[in-house]
Interface confidence: low
């Protein structure tokens, strides 16, 4: 028995064709993405095979102005209209609260939303009961299949889930899940889930009965074969697992942001053993048309867009690189341009002293989604902003002690080179890291501008001194494992709306031009 | 400069719970860093036994899952291991040490525990 | 579990010596991988991280090599206080597991 596994995670709020970078559609002949054109293919395949499964493995909400203006009514119309068959929930779909999880998304997904390893407790228990499921069993042609969920056990840490929801280990969570599906004489069982490729894999080798595994949450891209774009396979797909108990348990993911729809064909025997498991993600570029009825309706839901958001605020001569690739391992100008916006936005002076009270900022790598092609006439919008920080945190000022900003800057590379987020830009400050150095002395200068000064300067960073800074919510609360900023701050002020303080900037300045100018410099340091 | 410091009984009779601690000075366990338990029975090899994270998350072996339990007092820069229905297959010198997915870069001097009646 | 399978399981040698001692992993741990020291009687020291970086403090005669699943631990000249236990392990995955040891011994 053949089934075919059709599957997304990761989208991020890219209901329209995107960019070759999943930035916004410049050139629509080299687009890719979008709902219109994964409908075309779905469609396609669901007409020239018998079993078919559209599978989603979180993260739907956040990254542009459709999730910033429909708070995630969007992803259910839209995923409805394509019919998916189950979603995982990611961490991100907390990133509005459970409310704006409850109301937009699981009252009106007409698919099964799956988490196993998510309890809810207190009042919020009776509230949600059966609004997500810990698995489903589907029909598919003449068998069944069942699904399990499950989403990152860092959720608390990533996103607002609050205080009535408790994430359980993964493994641990869906074992009895798995169990009780084959007492339900269920045989075949995909574990659907947004954890990342790691535990995507430890599943794979550690939960009993699972046969295939559908990830999400590290963008991995996987393909066996010459791939067609500029992704760099982690591995063959599907990736192979030996289980602890011998079996080979396909593992995929399908990168991010609708580029690609994975496709996966497993043949099961009579058992519900996988015999067999190939396929590759198909690229969603301009050769695949764009379903006009989704089109239709994708336009029709645009206009309420476009009024919000396409006004032009400034225009940039220089392309505003805000790529992962970048900003998670060096200085990006994208950083610098942010971070000059967060200390012009808290300009305030106030004493003849200090020329400011505040010269520094830092900024998480990973909380810059976007970067901005100038090629398009220059123009930045708020849309484009909304890619690059379509989280809608704020930037608050906080005092810190100079010894918690050496822990932060240690944090920031403590395992540099796998594109984590922690990975720091900054303003006002000079760092040169040596990452020959063990995890925790990779810092070997951390100079400051002075704000006591009437001519700015840079100064080595005192361990005892306490220092205003200007950093995301998100850090300020001990996001990206920067518990030590948390834990340390002596004084913690909200501030403005992230893309408000951006487009506030570069609607003041008209006209910009940001560098990449030696704020950060890794001196390596050969034994 | 970070110490760590293993503490408790060196003998626990056959059935009974292990219990040690261990005491780090020059670092806050709830800065960063995970802090394990590591044993070595006489004569022979390391075996990792489990840690608990600086944000009071878990993660143990499981080959002694059932049995084992990290816990910490953060007021005191202390955490602890227990080690329930022993054996003499667990007699070992047991460490702690700093590391986790980050190698084991800070250790105890260790503690010899022996399971006898 | 990773099994990681050290070998000579021991090896005489003399001062001024090159040394190799090997370490393979049962799966794929890229660049996660820890040699230590322990001589009689103490704790375990750090020697190597990431499977090629001197730890702070240790000679240059001590490198590693290696990525995937195969790894190599070389003492360029063996000293008096080099004679001790070397251990490698993995930090992949949970759980973290050690090789069985190297017993470098005096000849």
């Known amino acids: 028995w053949e089934l075919t596994i059709l599957h997304t995670n990761d989208v991020h709020s890219r209901l329209e064709q995107t960019s070759e970078d999943s930035s916004k559609c410049v050139n629509a002949s080299r687009c890719m993405g979008g709902v219109a054109r994964l409908f075309t293919k779905v469609q396609q395949i669901r007409r020239a095979e018998p079993n078919v499964l559209l599978l989603d493995a979180g993260d739907q909400y956040q990254g542009t102005i459709w999730f910033t203006v429909y708070k995630g009514a969007e992803v259910a119309h839209f995923m409805n209209a394509l019919r998916y068959d189950a979603m995982a929930l990611g961490n991100h779909e907390f990133d509005n609260g459970v409310e704006g999880l409850i109301e937009p998304l699981l009252k009106e997904a007409k698919f099964p939303i799956l988490s196993a390893n998510i309890k809810a407790k207190g009042p919020l228990a009776s509230q949600i009961s059966g609004l997500y499921l810990p698995y489903k069993v589907l029909p598919v042609g003449d068998e069944v299949v069942g699904i399990v969920g499950y989403t990152s056990k860092e959720t608390p840490f990533l996103s607002n889930p609050g205080t009535n929801l408790v994430f359980e280990d993964e493994i641990t969570a869906l074992q009895p899940e798995v169990d009780k599906l084959k007492t339900l004489n269920v045989n075949k069982i995909i574990a659907l889930g947004h954890s990342g490729f790691e535990m995507d894999k430890l599943i794979a080798q550690k939960v009993r009965g699972v046969d295939v595994v559908v990830g999400g949450h590290s963008n991995t891209f996987l393909y066996t074969g010459n791939p067609p774009s500029k992704e760099v396979p982690a591995g063959k797909y599907p990736f192979i697992v030996t289980s602890d108990d011998g079996r080979k348990v396909p593992v995929v993911q399908a990168y991010a942001f609708g580029k690609y729809l994975g496709y996966l064909k497993i043949e099961f025997d009579e058992r519900g053993n996988v015999i067999s498991s190939h396929g590759n993600p198909i690229l969603l570029n301009s050769s695949i048309p764009e379903d006009p009825s989704i089109k239709a309706d994708i336009n029709k839901w645009r206009i309420k867009l476009d009024n919000y958001s396409t006004q032009e605020l400034g225009k940039t001569i220089v392309y505003l690189d805000g790529s992962s690739q970048s900003c998670r391992f060096r200085e990006c100008n994208m950083g610098n341009l942010i971070c000059d916006a967060m200390i012009n936005n808290n300009l305030r002076h106030t004493d003849e002293m200090f020329w400011n009270h505040v010269s520094m900022c830092i900024l998480n790598g990973g909380g810059i989604r976007s970067p901005i092609d100038e090629r398009n006439n220059g123009t930045i919008t708020w849309e484009n902003l909304a890619a690059v920080l379509p989280f809608g945190g704020t930037f608050d000022l906080v005092q810190l002690k100079g010894s918690t900003l050496k822990k932060a800057f240690e944090h920031s590379v403590h395992r540099y080179g796998q594109s984590t987020g922690e990975f720091l830009q900054v303003g006002g400050i000079h760092v040169v890291y040596d990452l020959s150095r063990k995890p925790g002395d990779r810092v070997v200068k951390l100079d400051v501008l002075c704000t006591k000064c009437r001519v700015p300067s840079y100064d080595p960073l005192k361990m005892d001194e306490v220092y205003k800074v200007i950093l995301p919510n998100f850090l300020a609360n001990g996001g990206d494992g920067f518990q030590m900023i948390k834990d340390e701050l002596l004084r913690h002020d909200s501030g403005d709306q992230d893309i408000n303080v951006v487009s506030t900037y570069i609607s003041k300045m008209k006209v910009i031009y940001p560098a990449v100018e030696g704020r950060i410099k890794h001196h390596h340091h050969h034994h | 400069q970070v110490q760590l410091q293993e503490s408790g009984p060196g003998l626990v009779k056959p059935s009974e719970t292990l219990s040690l601690t261990c005491t780090v000075s020059?670092?806050?366990?709830?800065?960063?860093?995970?802090w394990n338990w590591i044993r070595q029975p006489p004569g022979k090899g390391l075996e990792w036994i489990g840690y608990i994270t600086y944000d009071d998350n878990n993660n143990y072996n499981p080959s002694l899952k059932n049995r084992v339990t990290i816990s910490r007092d953060t007021s005191k820069n202390q955490f602890s291991l227990k080690l329930s229905s022993v054996t003499a297959a667990d007699t070992a010198v047991y460490y702690c040490a700093r590391g986790g997915w980050d190698p084991f870069l800070y250790w105890g001097q260790g503690t010899l525990v022996t399971v006898s009646s | 579990d990773i099994q990681m399978t050290q070998s000579p399981s021991s090896l005489s040698a003399s001062v001024g010596d090159r040394v190799t001692i090997t370490c393979r992993a049962s799966d794929n741990i890229y660049s996660y991988l820890a040699w230590y020291q322990q001589k009689p009687g103490k704790a375990p020291k750090l020697l190597i991280y990431s499977a090629k970086n001197l730890g702070e403090g240790v000679p240059s005669r001590f490198s590693g090599s290696g990525s995937g699943t195969d790894f190599t631990l070389t003492i360029s000249s063996l000293q008096p206080e080099d004679f001790a236990t070397y251990y490698c392990q993995h930090y992949y995955g949970t759980p973290f597991t050690f090789g069985g040891g190297t017993k470098v011994e005096i000849k």
């Open positions: 020059g670092y806050s366990i709830t800065s960063r860093y995970y």
